[in-house]
């Protein structure tokens, strides 16, 4: 199922910035999703549940995000990607077992001025 | 080696249009490269060699192209991708044997008007 996760629109525009969507299987209950910019961890979101099923979200890098039952979307300013960078979603699955780590969708993002005044978005199949 | 071919910039801007680059191994001497737009064959380029090593190029769909020893680039007008389509490079290798067919790089392309007046390019890792 993880192999199918690249089949979504990874990048889109959102309020003048870029929304990067990292999909994961709906069966996943507890996870860590990291967004890499080149080799640097740009965002790091962990969703876990305690012994009483209480949900805790850790977002140590304070990335604006939106979490659903099958995706984590991170919101970046255009400036964050103006130099051209490779972005990668990396998923760690804690629950259900077994523990898994997977590199999911990835893509190269470049924003630059254009006389055409258009936006070109390409994302993984 | 074929597995490494996605690691290039599939899409780029060129003279007001879009250049879609389909890479292949330098060892390939004779090939057919097809560019799919969704499920439709948009471009079809075949390079073969005759008994005297004479190169023949077939381009039945008359796509503007550029051929090198390791890539075929097709040039599309923006209008060709303005609706948002999935593009896929499909390679058939005739020489050297054995005959092989491979789907190479693919990506989703969407061009639309922007108030930001910028171009956003994302391409496969």
């Amino acid at each position: 199922e993880l192999n199918d996760l690249a089949n979504h629109r990874m990048f889109s525009f959102h309020d003048g910035g870029v929304q990067i969507s990292c999909n994961y299987p709906e069966t996943v209950q507890q996870l860590k999703m990291q967004l890499f910019k080149d080799r640097e961890v740009l965002c790091d979101l962990t969703k876990t549940k305690g012994s009483g099923n209480t949900v805790s979200i850790k977002n140590p890098m304070s990335c604006p995000y939106q979490l659903s039952n099958n995706s984590v979307s991170f919101f970046l300013d255009n400036a964050d990607s103006s130099q051209g960078s490779y972005f990668l979603c990396s998923l760690s699955i804690f629950d259900p077992p077994p523990f898994q780590e997977k590199n999911l969708s990835g893509g190269y993002l470049l924003i630059y001025e254009s006389q055409l005044c258009c936006q070109l978005k390409l994302w993984l199949p | 080696e074929l597995n490494d071919l996605a690691n290039h910039r599939m899409f780029s801007f060129h003279d007001g249009g879009v250049q879609i680059s389909c890479n292949y191994p330098e060892t390939v001497q004779q090939l057919k490269m097809q560019l799919f737009k969704d499920r439709e064959v948009l471009c079809d380029l075949t390079k073969t060699k005759g008994s005297g090593n004479t190169v023949s190029i077939k381009n039945p769909m008359s796509c503007p192209y550029q051929l090198s020893n390791n890539s075929v680039s097709f040039f599309l007008d923006n209008a060709d991708s303005s609706q948002g389509s999935y593009f896929l490079c499909s390679l058939s290798i005739f020489d050297p044997p054995p005959f092989q067919e491979k789907n190479l790089s693919g990506g989703y392309l969407l061009i639309y008007e922007s108030q930001l007046c910028c171009q956003l390019k994302l391409w496969l890792p």
Epitope: G50, S51, T54, S56, P96 | -
Partner: antibody
Framework: EVQLVESGGGLVKPGGSLKLSCAAS????????MDWVRQAPGKGLEWVGN????????NFAPSVKGRFTISRDNAKNTLYLQMNSVKSEDTATYYC??????????WGQGTLVTVSS | DIVMTQSPSSLAVSAGDKVTINCKSS??????????LIWYQQKTGQAPKLLIF???TRHTGVPDRFIGSGSGTDFTLTITSFQTEDLGDYYC?????????FGPGTKLEIK
């Protein structure tokens, strides 16, 4: 190897206070929810409470709510249980346990708390 | 709060016996395809040890003679061939909601 070592147990008078500690090693402490579970002599297991990674979320069993507090120091890899206004029914062996996402997968050896005048 | 009950409260067994311990919850523990039910073993003077989680998944290193089954409100821990080292108390626990609660336990003794 995951290790949890409780300390701080002992004899305490009814109405008194006691602070238990649990030193964790062998894993990234801040990645896990941590819990306290107790067991009265000759009785079954009773969940006391838990705390999330950063100490932002803390839950308690109804029997200890308002009297016990749980905290953690991730820099010291230590979990704490502050027991106030203790009662005789709080007499038990107190275990700290790591919540391994879907079960208590590691337990300490326990520390005995006796509430008696 | 969800109430957990276990039966029997104690059981006298011999080596090689098939042992069945039952656990019942006051409401369904099934959510998103998973039963939020755990089994622990506790030997005298020791801390509990995890045996089974999600009602039927054996924890790492647990012998395959321990089998968890059941769904919803009714669960069973089966020891297909009891060994003397299996002596001790067995507890079920839910983690469906807060507070997580344990069953009262089942004590296995030698016949």
């Amino acid at each position: 190897e995951v290790q949890l070592v409780e300390s701080g147990g002992g004899l305490v008078k009814p109405g008194g206070s006691l602070k238990l500690s649990c030193a964790a090693s062998g894993f990234t402490f801040s990645d896990y929810w941590m819990d306290w579970v107790r067991q009265a002599p000759g009785k079954g297991l009773e969940w006391v409470g838990n705390i999330d990674h950063d100490g932002n979320i803390i839950n308690f069993a109804p029997s200890v709510k308002g009297r016990f507090t749980i905290s953690r120091d991730n820099a010291k890899n230590t979990l704490y249980l502050q027991m106030n206004s203790v009662k005789s029914e709080d007499t038990a062996t107190y275990y700290c346990a790591r919540w391994g996402h879907y079960a208590f997968d590691s337990w300490g050896q326990g520390t005995l708390v006796t509430v008696s005048s | 709060d969800i109430v957990m009950t276990q039966s029997p409260s104690s059981l006298a067994v011999s080596a090689g016996d098939k042992v069945t311990i039952n656990c019942k919850s006051s409401q369904s523990l099934l959510s998103s395809g998973y039963n939020y039910l755990i089994w622990y073993q506790q030997k005298t003077g020791q801390a509990p040890k995890l045996l089974i989680f999600y009602a039927s998944t054996r924890h790492t290193g647990v012998p395959d003679r321990f089998i968890g089954s059941g769904s919803g409100t009714d669960f069973t821990l089966t020891i297909t061939s009891f060994q003397t080292e299996d002596l001790g108390d067995y507890y079920c626990q839910h983690h469906y909601s807060s507070p997580p609660t344990f069953g009262p336990g089942t004590k296995l003794e030698i016949k």
